[in-house]
Interface confidence: medium
């Protein structure tokens, strides 16, 4: 049960030994109690107990005091849980009875008679302190105290509230006076079942099982998971995502140890959009009001901006957009209304209230719509929160990420290494590369897994100039020149300056 | 589901009148906004007055003084009084109403042909 209702009787005092029907009992009255708890009544009432009911063995003949007793037949106080919501108030009513019978059941005796009733009604706050009271009629008095305490585990002004402390994998906590949790520390969350991470550890690319802890997930490393990892043999660049080598400024090639001028020799940007040589593919382009895209490649409708409001339909014109409003609004962007809240102008379930004598409205919206007339469900994709690709959906009162395959994490953040299984054959290298893995082959392999045995060796010949490394298997001819700093050309035969007339991968 | 009838369009010379009807079949109509739009031939549509359940109105400058919008709940009928019509008010005329921003109804549309 949620908790327990005790009676201590204290003393009883019968001194004529007289029943209430006035006779007297021979040769005294050996007592005992009938107690019965019920909802509160302002006539209390025949009928059942609701709230529970108890019978003592014989206390005592006459006039008794009754003594604590923990256990057994006889105990005192008397106790009667119950497994409800206590509801601060009750009718209590106790009866002492004369038994000619056995002194352990006398409820099974024949022939009881009454001595006295007592009845009280009135409110008990749960709580430690007893309540004494004292009731007197023409032949007895009854000295008792009662008091209301929650059973273990129980807690709160009417013992509604569970709460049993733990230390294991399904929570780490005490109880307070109250019922409330209070984490162990070093754990956190409504049922303290999230341990807190050493302090600064990344929240999404480290984590722990256990407090002050810092696990990094894969790409990532130190002490707070906050570095990520960059490519291995990334020379001149840097990492913002792991396993990314981003090249600095004039750097290019697999391993960022190829000087190139991307701009000058590829002019990627389009609609007379800016080209600078920075960013992770080597250029950024720049563009020019009314285009988007990578290249500045695209040219924005004049209603991306969503332009017209209170659910106006845009229409693009050739320098221009129109606004074609809803009735009840009007102006260029359907900002002006008409409307009061007798149009019922608020939906989704929002609450119109009037503003200036009722000339005008306001809508009051509920969670997860909003805009003047609470038209727009809450798009916690606008932010666009996926990395890499990633789909953003919305869910309800949340949104995931559908991350593009090779990635994943709560973002799609983190990059699952293509690398992981091994792919190239015959000890060669693999490399982790956006669009896949490549493979550099040993000698006498080639294939995109160097899975092809070569009868002659593409790099036997010595095919690369000026001191050039040779990697046979990355090309359909079988060989790859990767040029010391200063050199170009698909051999890294001409010194930088000199544009080479053909592309540098053989 | 509303359905919307656009009736009283014609042929009329320059400086005539006409009136237009709008009837509402399939739901409470005085808790509705109605509006009359109207498209020119290879123009935008475009809002040309419209009328709120208390019967506050509102008019394009373009229509402002000549043109006249009421209803009449009773009959579940929407109006509007075209007076001092000009040939550039020749268009297609549409009534419309909104219950709410996935709900929009449109009537299929009446001929007006102001001729000069």
């Known amino acids: 049960g949620s908790g327990i209702f005790q009676l201590r009787l204290q003393e009883f005092v019968n001194q004529r030994g007289m029943l209430a029907n006035g006779q007297s009992c021979e040769p005294g009255c050996r007592t005992f109690f009938r107690i019965c708890l019920k909802h509160f009544q302002a006539t209390f009432s025949e009928g059942p107990c609701t709230f529970g009911n108890v019978s003592t063995p014989v206390l005592g003949t006459n006039s008794f005091v009754v003594r604590d007793k923990n256990s057994g037949s006889g105990r005192n106080p008397l106790q009667l849980p119950f497994n409800f919501t206590w509801p601060g108030t009750f009718s209590l009513n106790i009866q002492a009875w004369h038994t000619p019978g056995d002194d352990l059941r006398p409820e099974t005796s024949p022939g009881n008679s009454l001595i006295s009733q007592i009845i009280i009604q009135g409110s008990l706050a749960v709580g430690k302190i007893w309540r004494t009271d004292e009731q007197n009629d023409t032949l007895t008095r009854l000295s008792y105290s009662y008091r209301v305490i929650c059973s273990d585990n129980y807690y709160g002004e009417s013992c509604s509230r569970l709460c049993k402390k733990r230390d294991d994998h399904f929570g780490h906590y005490e109880c307070q006076p109250d019922g409330s949790l209070s984490c162990l520390p070093g754990w956190t969350g409504k049922y303290c079942d999230q341990p807190i991470c050493l302090s600064g550890c990344h929240e999404q690319n480290g984590y722990c099982s256990k407090p002050d802890e810092c696990i990094c997930r894969p790409g990532w490393q130190g002490r707070l998971c906050n570095e990520c990892i960059p490519h291995n043999g990334c020379r001149h660049g840097t990492c913002s995502i792991p396993w990314q080598c981003a090249c600095d400024e004039g750097w290019g090639g697999l391993f960022c140890d190829q000087d190139l001028n991307y701009c000058t020799h590829h002019s990627p940007c389009k609609n007379g959009s800016t080209c600078s040589n920075s960013g992770p593919k080597g250029y950024t382009c720049t563009c020019l009001p009314g285009y988007t895209g990578e290249h500045c490649e695209l040219g924005l409708s004049k209603c991306a901006s969503n332009p017209c409001r209170n659910g106006g339909s845009c229409k693009d014109q050739e320098n221009s957009y129109h606004c074609l409003c809803p009735p009840g609004y009007y102006g260029q962007h359907c900002e002006h209304s008409t409307l009061t809240c007798a149009d019922s102008p608020c939906f989704n379930g929002g609450s119109c209230r009037e503003r200036n004598q009722g000339s005008s409205y306001a809508c009051e919206c509920p969670p997860n719509f909003t805009g003047s007339n609470c038209e727009k469900k809450v798009d916690r994709c606008t932010s666009n929160p996926c990395a890499n690709g990633g789909q953003c959906q919305n869910r309800g009162p949340s949104r995931t990420c559908r991350c593009r395959p090779g990635f994943t994490g709560t973002h799609c953040e983190l990059h699952i290494s293509d690398c992981a299984r091994s792919p190239c054959a015959h000890g060669g290298t693999c490399h982790d590369l956006e669009n896949g893995p490549v493979c550099t082959c040993p000698a006498g392999f080639s294939g995109r897994r160097c899975e092809v045995r070569i009868t002659h060796d593409a790099c036997a010949s010595g095919p690369c100039f000026n001191g050039a490394t040779c990697y046979t298997g990355l090309s359909p001819n079988n060989f790859v020149c990767n040029c010391p700093y200063g050199f170009v050309g698909s051999r890294c035969e001409f010194p930088v300056g000199l544009p080479p007339s053909f592309p540098w991968v053989a | 589901e509303v359905q919307l009838v656009e009736s009283g369009g014609g042929l009329v010379q320059a400086g005539g009148s006409l009136r237009l009807s709008c009837a509402a079949a399939g739901s409470t109509f005085s808790s509705y906004v109605m509006g009359w739009y109207r498209q020119a031939p290879g123009k935008q549509r475009e809002l040309v007055a419209h009328i709120s359940t208390r019967g506050i109105t509102y008019y394009a400058d373009s229509v402002k003084g000549r043109f006249t919008i009421s209803r009449d709940n009773a009959k579940n009928t929407m109006y509007l009084q075209m007076n001092s019509l000009k040939p550039e008010d020749t268009a297609v005329y549409y009534c419309?109403?909104?219950?709410?921003?996935?709900?929009?109804?449109w009537g299929q549309g009446t001929q007006v042909t102001v001729s000069s």
């Open positions: 419309n109403t909104r219950r709410n921003f996935l709900s929009n109804y």
